[in-house]
Interface confidence: low
């Protein structure tokens, strides 16, 4: 599995003078010059930094660098008809009205264009009502107060905070529950680290500062407008009463000083509990409506927020394989930011763009990679991760018979504590292997490898000595690689420690304070957590590409598929009653991942034994391990989300960030207890174990001998 | 308490036939898997039989397979092993235990065993 | 079968010695393997569940590791009721194997 065999070459030219090549005043300086003005999607800026990209691509030696557009929906605020949110008495006066935009950074305070915050795509709409709190605006949450506290939230504008799942799974959330308006806010608990100073004296979140982002409720369909298919100049366009995963309801941000004032009148009820409160100095009431002296007074939303059909631009870059051109391993990360996007997402676009002047610098000295290496910069991703869907739209038959792997490269830092790594059972080796070989840019472990602190800062919690990986879920741009079309993908950033933080973010996320000073000063002024992430991530994609047998380890596969199996297994075996009552038996997707497990082990052998130098056995053994991750793909996909297709691994219903392990099984056993026809709700379960059971076994089968 | 209570061992002759039971307490029989595991004197552990919650699916070591059965009554709390053609080597002392995680990893509680002789 | 090897067959160890028994799987077993302690004449006690995972009221002197073929159990600082026979035992396939135990006797 060495790379050193890779084609065209010297022996200098291996994964060690690609690492070499990477430098961390580049990265520092690349991020620097993409953080000057906002990159919006859809707006002149991003189109010139598209160009700007190209050209130095080009310059750094790619065979081709093409801009791919497209025509998509998008959302921006109505210049002339500010967003706002007010309190208003028993006249119909607004006696409290929220800020129109975040007080600009020092330095900053006359760049044009700073989007003022807002929620992309939120429909229009003026609702006053009474207010509910519905803490984190969970599915959880909201049976805590539907069934236990018997609150109605039906017509009412439900507030929720920032943090733990995706914001378009809380929106989703309170439509469901009859909410006529949704207002975020980012809660100083979860936006506010102890100890910590806020911007721009340190890196937490000011009072003023507010998370920008998109509410959709896409599952992975790309252009609302144009599901399934590129959004290209001759598209048919749905109509916006057809449109996919738009919210019904208006939906608006707002910052902690603005949320203090709405919710220390709240009345109603208290909070269920100590997990219900945040940090401001505020009851954490759950209302409905404000207490007493205030109770005549409402809560109106006022949004003037516009979609539009506007043109994106991908920047794709190629670096043909000498060996094996027809085979894509693919880098790929997003370019337009919020605002300047300091840490999301041009952390990572200044990676990538190191890494792109590093494989330039080996061509021009005669090295190809073995196989084809396509390099991406994404456009629309906080628009839903719209360039990389409607670009894999347009090119899924290549993909879907030539797409090796999928590396992401969205932001590069999200603390500077250590590693964090999602990605397929197949990358585990791949990665643990490179990690060994990296060294540590953590204080304390100098001279000690990247897999040492990282095993160290975040154990397996499966096995001693080894680190965590997690499942990949979505939220970014490997959505449409992984979960449509079943190619093996892989995510790596330096994180903090995250053990009680799962999902909230940095504080200053999504905020105009996403700065290149952010960066430079308060988390990564040698920028050698970027030079590390720019290794990881490079290095993945250079061992992908060039090494003779592609580093996959199926036999890791077999390892998960038993213990998500043993977890669905466990969650089902709550209801035993029902599981005899209607013959419920997980027989069949427990002999299946024994059977993938048995020929897993029988290839893993073939594989160390056969002859590397014949070349028609070398791809025959390559395909099998290229189409593996594809074998997981159910052509019709989950009940309801057609375009999540992988049996084993979706974006949680509950939270799209979070992964799910055999998601149509989970579904169907999520709340049965309360489904009207138990009969059909467990006939469901069977048909998803059946699924999920004939799934694992055909992946199986393709690794076993062909002949 | 979590128990589990073997009886019905004893002297059998090669040949003859043997009935165990294990009587279980302080949990939810139906919801777990459950195993036979044997020792013969002053030698090691060796598994001899699973069964699932309901007594659907049943496991059997490969040289057990046709003599010995395993089955449940869940309205008796109670596990069963059905020894036929018993022969010498099937002397040992036969441990019930409760299966658990998932399928039937791990074995999380014992009962004291019962003693199987099979000797003319 | 999947055959467990366990090494040594036998240990000698003194009260607050570090021990180690090792377990070997003939083929790659994942992370599917669990520990017992048996003293004579009682039934087995589950010690280590899934190579390494604690079982509750187990004392944290008690420890699993490895992955794959090769597993070890070790006893930090050996204590009087530690004396006993050990065994691994494997989930991965059926037919589940034990190994044929390590016999830990005092010194």
């Known amino acids: 599995k060495s790379s050193n065999e890779a084609t065209n070459i010297t022996p200098k030219h291996n994964m060690k003078a690609f690492l070499d090549e990477l430098k961390a005043e580049n990265i520092k300086k690349f991020l620097y010059n993409f953080t000057q003005i906002p990159h919006l999607a859809g707006t002149e800026q991003n189109f010139q930094l598209a160009k700007q990209i190209q050209s130095q691509w080009k310059e750094f030696g790619l065979d081709s660098v093409e801009l791919a557009h497209y025509d998509v929906l998008l959302s921006y605020p109505n210049k002339t008809h500010p967003n706002y949110i007010s309190i208003i008495n028993e006249d119909g006066n607004e006696i409290f009205n929220t800020s129109l935009f975040e007080p600009p950074p020092p330095g900053y305070e006359n760049v044009s264009d700073i989007v003022p915050p807002f929620s992309a795509f939120s429909p229009q709409g003026m609702p006053e009502g009474d207010l509910v709190y519905v803490n984190y605006a969970r599915t959880e949450d909201f049976f805590k107060l539907e069934r236990d506290m018997k609150i109605n939230c039906s017509g009412k504008i439900v507030i929720a905070r920032y943090g733990k799942v995706f914001r378009g799974n809380k929106v989703k959330n309170a439509q469901l529950a009859g909410a006529k308006g949704v207002i975020l806010y980012s809660d100083p608990a979860d936006y506010f680290a102890p100890g910590v100073k806020s911007y721009p004296d340190g890196w937490n979140l000011p009072g003023g500062g507010v998370q920008r982002g998109n509410i959709l409720n896409l599952n992975g369909a790309g252009d609302p407008l144009t599901p399934g298919y590129p959004a290209n100049e001759y598209a048919y366009r749905r109509g916006i009463a057809e449109a996919v995963g738009l919210p019904s309801i208006p939906v608006h941000p707002i910052g902690y000083y603005d949320a203090q004032k709405l919710l220390e009148k709240m009345g109603g009820s208290a909070p269920p509990d100590s997990s219900w409160r945040g940090s401001l100095k505020v009851p954490y009431n759950v209302g409905p409506g404000f207490t007493g002296n205030f109770s005549t007074q409402k809560v109106k939303m006022h949004i003037h927020s516009t979609n539009e059909v506007t043109r994106i631009y991908n920047v794709i870059g190629t670096l043909r394989g000498a060996v094996e051109p027809d085979r894509y391993v693919i880098l790929g990360g997003h370019r337009d930011s919020w605002v300047f996007g300091g840490i999301d997402p041009q952390s990572g676009a200044a990676v990538v763009h190191e890494i792109v002047r590093s494989f330039g610098t080996l061509k021009k000295e005669g090295w190809r990679p073995r196989r084809t290496i396509l390099f991406a910069s994404w456009d629309a991703e906080e628009f839903g991760l719209l360039g990389s869907t409607e670009w894999a739209e347009e090119n899924s038959r290549l993909l879907q018979e030539r797409g090796v792997a999928y590396i992401n490269a969205d932001s590069s830092i999200e603390g500077n504590y250590t590693l964090r790594v999602d990605c397929t059972p197949l990358m585990y080796s791949l990665v643990h292997n490179l990690t060994k070989e990296l060294k540590s840019p953590d204080e304390g472990f100098e001279g000690k490898s990247l897999y040492e602190s990282w095993t160290k800062k975040s154990p397996s919690p499966e096995f001693s000595g080894m680190p965590r990986i997690s499942k990949l879920g979505s939220g970014n741009d490997f959505e449409v690689f992984f979960q449509r079309l079943g190619i093996a993908s892989g995510r790596a950033r330096y994180t903090k420690n995250w053990e009680t933080n799962k999902f909230s973010g940095y504080p200053l996320y999504h905020s105009v304070y996403e700065t290149y000073e952010l960066v430079e000063k308060f988390y990564d002024p040698m920028f050698k957590y970027h030079l590390t992430v720019a290794q990881v991530r490079g290095g993945m994609v250079f061992e992908l590409a060039n090494s003779i047998v592609l580093p996959f380890d199926c036999r890791d596969y077999a390892v998960v598929l038993r213990k998500y199996a043993d977890k669905i297994y466990s969650i089902s075996m709550k209801h035993p009653q029902e599981m005899k009552t209607y013959s419920v038996s997980f027989d069949s997707l427990f002999s299946a991942v024994k059977n993938f497990t048995e020929i897993a082990s029988k290839f893993s052998e073939r594989l160390q034994d056969f002859d590397k130098s014949n070349p028609i056995v070398l791809r025959m053994m390559n395909d099998q391990l290229m189409f593996l991750e594809r074998a997981f793909i159910d052509p019709l996909g989950l009940p309801d989300r057609p375009f999540y297709r992988h049996v084993i691994y979706a974006p949680s219903s509950h939270n799209k960030y979070a992964g799910e392990s055999f998601p149509g099984i989970y579904d169907a056993l999520f709340d049965i207890e309360s489904k009207v026809d138990p009969s059909k709700a467990w006939g469901e379960v069977k048909r998803q174990i059946y699924v999920a059971a004939f799934t694992v076994q055909a992946a199986a089968e393709t690794l076993s001998e062909v002949a | 308490e979590v128990q589990l209570v073997e009886s019905g061992g004893g002297l059998v002759q090669p040949g003859g036939s043997m009935r165990l039971s294990c009587a279980a307490s302080g949990f939810t029989f139906s919801d777990y898997y459950m195993a036979w595991v044997r020792q013969a004197p002053g030698k090691g552990l060796e598994w001899v039989a699973n069964i699932n919650y309901d007594g659907t699916s049943t496991y059997y070591a490969d040289s057990l397979k046709g003599r010995f059965t395993i089955s449940r009554d869940s309205s008796k709390n109670t596990l069963y092993l059905q020894m036929n053609s018993l022969r010498a080597e099937d002397t040992a002392v036969y441990y019930c235990?409760?299966?658990?995680?998932?399928?039937?990893?791990?074995?999380?509680?014992w009962g004291q065993g019962t003693t199987v002789t099979v000797s003319s | 079968d999947i055959q467990l090897t366990q090494s040594p067959s036998s240990l000698s160890a003194s009260v607050g010695d570090r021990v180690t028994l090792t377990c070997r799987a003939s083929?790659?077993?994942?992370?599917?393997l669990h520990w017992y302690q048996q003293k004579p004449g009682k039934a087995p006690k589950l010690l280590i569940k899934?190579?390494?995972q604690s079982i509750s009221g187990i004392p944290s002197r008690f420890s699993g590791s490895g992955l794959g073929t090769d597993f070890t159990l070790t006893i930090s600082s050996v204590q009087p009721e530690d004396f006993a026979t050990y065994y691994c035992q494997q989930s991965n396939s059926w037919p589940y194997t034990f190994g044929q135990g390590t016999k830990l006797e005092i010194k």
């Open positions: 083929q790659s077993i994942s992370n599917n």
């Open positions: 899934y190579v390494s």
């Open positions: 235990a409760r299966a658990l995680d998932g399928y039937y990893g791990y074995l999380d509680v």
